[in-house]
Interface confidence: low
């Protein structure tokens, strides 16, 4: 199975009903505190606004947020940690009418209400301490 380069950046066009699918594995054991970060940018630039920021501190917590006018907004934290040490996982981000819903291995765990219109999202970036085997956007 070929690995995708990380950071992995793709231009996207999202709307209600879109699904972003990511398959990956933490690069190191949880004891070394690897991270996963997924950012939905409003432009094809890393310093642009972020409609949805999803960050996993493996073995610890998940943080969700948005960045507007270069300012981070109110953080949403979850202690749910369905990821297993050393195990590959499938992450699906569903674009619903009112929120993003994040599923891990087929089960819904996280929700993040839209703060920036989904139509503004132009690019998705997946990065940090993971090996990435799949990135797919279906509309």
């Amino acid at each position: 199975m070929s690995l995708l380069s990380v950071p992995h950046t793709e231009s996207v066009s999202l709307s209600t009903g879109s699904t972003v699918t990511i398959e990956a594995r933490p690069l190191v054991c949880f004891f070394n505190e690897p991270h996963l970060q997924v950012d939905f940018h409003t432009e094809m630039k890393e310093d642009s606004d972020i409609a949805f920021h999803f960050q996993v501190y493996f073995g610890n917590r998940v943080v969700m947020n948005s960045r507007e006018y270069r300012t981070w907004k109110e953080e949403v934290e979850s202690k749910n940690m369905p990821f297993q040490d050393g195990q590959e996982f499938e992450l699906r981000i569903l674009v619903l009418e009112d929120k993003y819903q994040v599923m891990v291995n087929g089960q819904a765990y996280y929700n993040f209400n839209h703060r920036i219109p989904v139509s503004s999202v132009k690019m998705v970036q997946v990065w940090r301490d993971i090996s990435l085997t799949k990135f797919n956007v279906s509309n």
Epitope: F30, F31, G59, K79, N80, M81, P82, F83, Q84, D85
Partner: nanobody
Framework: QVQVQESGGGLVQAGNSLRLSCAAS????????MMWFRQAPGKEREFVAA???????YCANSVKGRCTISRDNAKDTVYLQMNSLKPEDTAVYFC???????????????WGKGTLVTVSS
Amino acid sequence: QVQVQESGGGLVQAGNSLRLSCAASGRTFSSYHMMWFRQAPGKEREFVAAIAWRGGTYCANSVKGRCTISRDNAKDTVYLQMNSLKPEDTAVYFCAASLRYVFDPSAMDYWGKGTLVTVSS
């Protein structure tokens, strides 16, 4: 495989404290996240507290500030300390082990049989 057994339940006066123990057997105990759930009569099983294999802890909002969860990997035991008990804390308390740090009963890999805690006013 992990077997878990709870102890320490009983009748307690409201306002008092209680420490529950969960003894586990199985060589891989230290790699499991350990959780406490409770089930009051006629109600669904609800999450109380969790301790990750590395020691990070989390208590549900319903017991926050009154709950301390700890583990002793050398003794293969998890402890739940509950302070300022209320009549609504009356329930059967269950210990569970999971490879996933998720506060959902359906995600647990192993369960104990439970220990009854009755809080009288």
